[in-house]
Amino acid sequence: QNASRGRRQRRMHPNVSQGCQGGCATCSDYNGCLSCKPRLFFVLERIGMKQIGVCLSSCPSGYYGTRYPDINKCTKCKADCDTCFNKNFCTKCKSGFYLHLGKCLDNCPEGLEANNHTMECVNIVHCEVSEWNPWSPCTKKGKTCGFKRGTETRVREIMQHPSAKGNLCPPTNETRKCTVQRKKCQKGERGKKGRERKRKKPNKGESKEAIPDSKGLESSKETPEQRENKQQQKKRKVQDKQQKSVSVSTVH
């Protein structure tokens, strides 16, 4: 594109197109191109103490092209602008400046912040979090049985991370104490962590007590012992429905 830039032509004569190179329509030995072939842009390049005319298919960085009836001319963007559509609309600022509404600024206006990656002034983005998820089952040391007082946790997700000047995110987990009716751990449940095992959806009023099932146990067949346990659990259901969890909220 810029192959002809700065190149001196051999034996050029004023206003004579023969011998002109690099898209010139007319040229002179001293000033280079004087006019350009159709659709090419004319730009003056300073070389030492003099200016040389050059014809280009598009304007160099820091310039934009305007087509007039008599000349297609490259015009300089504003001093702080690297690439522009015209004088009013810069599209890329020079180093150390931030682009805002087509202008280049040393600092971003109030209510906006500098994005040092894109070198633009952008809206401040505040943290956004989801609603809290439901409380987890009441557990102690990772188990859902063999205790009366434990803790339960709930979490929420960060939906939008904040930008540099944005409000920080609030806590995304919350833990509180909980009290349940003490329940013996079943055989095979001992040491199992509540969160590792799939739980049946608790019935109303049973939210604080995990109901064991055969998943994760050594045998998938029901042993007489397990049948007996199930019957005991059924008997407890009535009592469990009346049992309500007493809890104290503590945010960590």
Partner: antibody
Framework: EVQLVESGGGVVQPGRSLRLSCAAS????????MAWVRQAPGKGLEWVAT????????YYRDSVKGRFTISRDNSKNTLYLQMNSLRAEDTAVYYC?????????WGQGTMVTVSS | DIQLTQSPSSLSASVGDRVTITCRAS??????LAWYQQKPGKAPKLLIY???SLIHGVPSRFSGSGSGTDFTLTISSLQPEDFATYYC?????????FGQGTKLEIK
């Protein structure tokens, strides 16, 4: 804030003259090419004339060549349009605008009515 | 002179509609095309330049596309404030010319 305010419009008889002015503020007037664009009642937009930033070159649409003259006074931040030999078809709202490929900033317009 | 022909000349639509206005040039204008919006009694306002570059502050529901001789302005979901007349303009050649306009009316 860029502001362009036109003045000088009015009712004039065919063949007479009128001079429109456009006072500019809020930007470096001497850096910008300026133009006049007109809009006949109920019609579309029509470019009339452009003058480059330093006043050294002017361009006109064919229908106004020889009758209209665009000029500027950079020391006064003012653009002018001298309209001679006015015709009925010159009736329009005349807008001044910055002209840098697109017409980025516009005045509110001044109405010129050519009628006998 | 390069002629720009807009279609349709007028268009009735409802809030929320997707609307497309076309602008056809009589010769290749590359990507030297702009779109303007004009409301009654007001000066035109530049919306888009270089076919698809949105002016800052113009809502993203406005978009432009095309090259050469065929161009479109699309409003993805019409809002009450979008009812106006829209003009295309080419700046590839002097004289810079405008399309005849497309009047967007409420249905």
């Amino acid at each position: 804030e860029v502001q362009l305010v036109e003045s000088g419009g009015g009712v004039v008889q065919p063949g007479r003259s009128l001079r429109l002015s456009c006072a500019a503020s809020g930007f470096t007037f001497s850096d910008y090419d300026m133009a006049w664009v007109r809009q006949a009642p109920g019609k579309g937009l029509e470019w009339v004339a452009t003058i480059i930033y330093d006043g050294s070159r002017t361009y006109y649409r064919d229908s106004v060549k020889g009758r209209f003259t665009i000029s500027r006074d950079n020391s006064k931040n003012t653009l002018y349009l001298q309209m001679n030999s006015l015709r009925a078809e010159d009736t329009a709202v005349y807008y001044c605008a910055t002209h840098d490929k697109t017409f980025d900033y516009w005045g509110q317009g001044t109405m010129v009515t050519v009628s006998s | 002179d390069i002629q720009l022909t807009q279609s349709p000349s007028s268009l009735s639509a409802s809030v929320g509609d997707r609307v497309t206005i076309t602008c056809r040039a009589s010769e290749d204008i590359y990507s030297d095309l702009a779109w303007y919006q004009q409301k009654p009694g007001k000066a035109p306002k530049l919306l888009i330049y270089d076919v698809n570059s949105l002016i800052h502050g113009v809502p993203s529901r406005f978009s432009g596309s095309g090259s050469g001789t065929d161009f479109t302005l699309t409003i993805s979901s019409l809002q009450p404030e979008d009812f106006a007349t829209y003009y295309c303009q080419q700046y590839d050649n002097y004289p810079n010319t405008f399309g005849q306009g497309t009047k967007l009316e409420i249905k």
